[in-house]
């Protein structure tokens, strides 16, 4: 019988008949080791590979370039998959991006992009996006014209300032841009008026820090 093909992403996992959300192992092109990821099989048809998740502030997201490159945290909770893995996955085929957000009042919203990929490390993991829709604001809170990834030890933003140092976390900062889902986690009551919080400008404004976020990707042809 034909040898089983390894899963490239959570879409492959779903299409193989595994339709429960949870942790699965995927084999990404050009990556030497398999990678454990959280697969969301519930939202909008399932098949989503989670690349970022925030929910309780248990994980420190104020990290350097190398850690954002290779990832940190645990897919069972808060984590960043790793820019090298995100680059490798989104180089396999065309992907869309969905971002799920929740505020401290329990309101949920999402932003979705028809096309999503990032450049390689030499390109500072530059963000490429097209086709924004969703309920988290009419305008995109991610820079559509492209932005390089910055961390506290790698200042690639478009500002006279150092966005990643000032706003904390690694992100595709512009100057500094309308979002930062890797900012400081602030609890209820402490989450207003924060420059360096978990921000999605067109959902809750420039200084409201969100309660939970999930970034996930799925092939366009799913």
């Amino acid at each position: 019988r034909e040898e089983e093909k390894p899963f490239r992403d959570c879409a492959d996992v779903y299409q193989a008949g595994f339709n429960k959300s949870g942790i699965y192992t995927i084999y990404i092109n050009n990556m030497p080791e398999p990678k454990k990821v959280f697969c969301n099989m519930d939202v909008n048809g399932g098949g989503w590979t989670v690349i970022q998740h925030r929910e309780d502030g248990s994980l420190d997201f104020q990290r350097g370039w190398k850690e954002y490159k290779m990832g940190f945290g645990n897919p069972s909770g808060e984590y960043w998959l790793g820019n090298e893995f995100i680059f490798a996955i989104t180089s396999q085929r065309q992907y869309m991006l969905r971002i799920e957000l929740m505020d401290w009042e329990g309101n949920r919203a999402y932003s979705q992009y028809d096309r999503f990929h990032i450049g390689n490390e030499k390109q500072n993991y530059r963000l490429y996006l097209k086709g924004h829709t969703g309920t988290a604001g009419k305008q995109s809170s991610l820079i559509l014209h492209g932005a390089d990834f910055s961390t506290k030890d790698a200042d690639n933003d478009n500002c006279m300032c150092k966005c990643a140092l000032m706003l904390t976390g690694g992100w595709w900062f512009d100057a500094c841009g309308p979002s930062n889902l890797n900012g400081m986690f602030y609890t209820a009551g402490q989450n207003h008026g924060k420059l360096n919080g978990i921000k999605w400008h067109y959902f809750k404004g420039p200084s409201y820090s969100l309660r939970s976020t999930t970034m996930m990707i799925r092939p366009l042809d799913f």
Epitope: C159, M160, C161, G177, G193, L195
Partner: antibody, heavy 122, light 112 residues
Amino acid sequence: EVQLVQSGGGVVQPGRSLRLSCAASGFTFSSYGMHWVRQAPGKGLEWVSYISSSGSTIYYADSVKGRFTISRDNAKNSLYLQMNSLRAEDTAVYYCARDLLDYDIWTGYGYWGQGTLVTVSS
Amino acid sequence: DIVMTQSPLSLPVTPGEPASISCRSSQSLLHSNGYNYLDWYLQKPGQSPQLLIYLGSNRASGVPDRFSGSGSGTDFTLKISRVEAEDVGVYYCMQATHWPPTFGQGTKLEIK
């Protein structure tokens, strides 16, 4: 390269009007709050007015409230200051200045125009 | 309005020597978000002001590392570790924690 090029200054009699312009280039103008700051001859700096990126929020210094009007045209990448009922004490070099950070996060003036002199004299 | 008081108002310095400018505010500039909205600007002769330090201690891009800002609450300091001839001009502190934004009266740095 970020540029703020000012125009519209000159000599005007007390009680008359003048309109200053500030043409922006090299950045996404519609994403930034903008300010007017002035400097009387031989004196220090004084903040005059602020307008948010969309134009929905506007503030004025008490010394100009009711006489000056700040506005912006994001389609033309331009900032304006309409100055009415001018007084001798309004004589100053007027600077337009851009917020350091986008999306109306206040952290100071990242870029300044070259300044334009307004002289109010009879 | 918040009153910003700088000292000294005049500062003659020998090239290569350090320099220090103090800025005091009439109320605390420490915002509830943990930031001090205090900037330092330099206005060189015949030029527009330029941003040196933002949020109390953050050096703007392109500003030499001989410039540093420190302080919190009501007392702030701008230090130049080794003054160079190109550093001459008037230095202003400015607060934006409380509306309206207000400037200090300026400190004129000159070379001895």
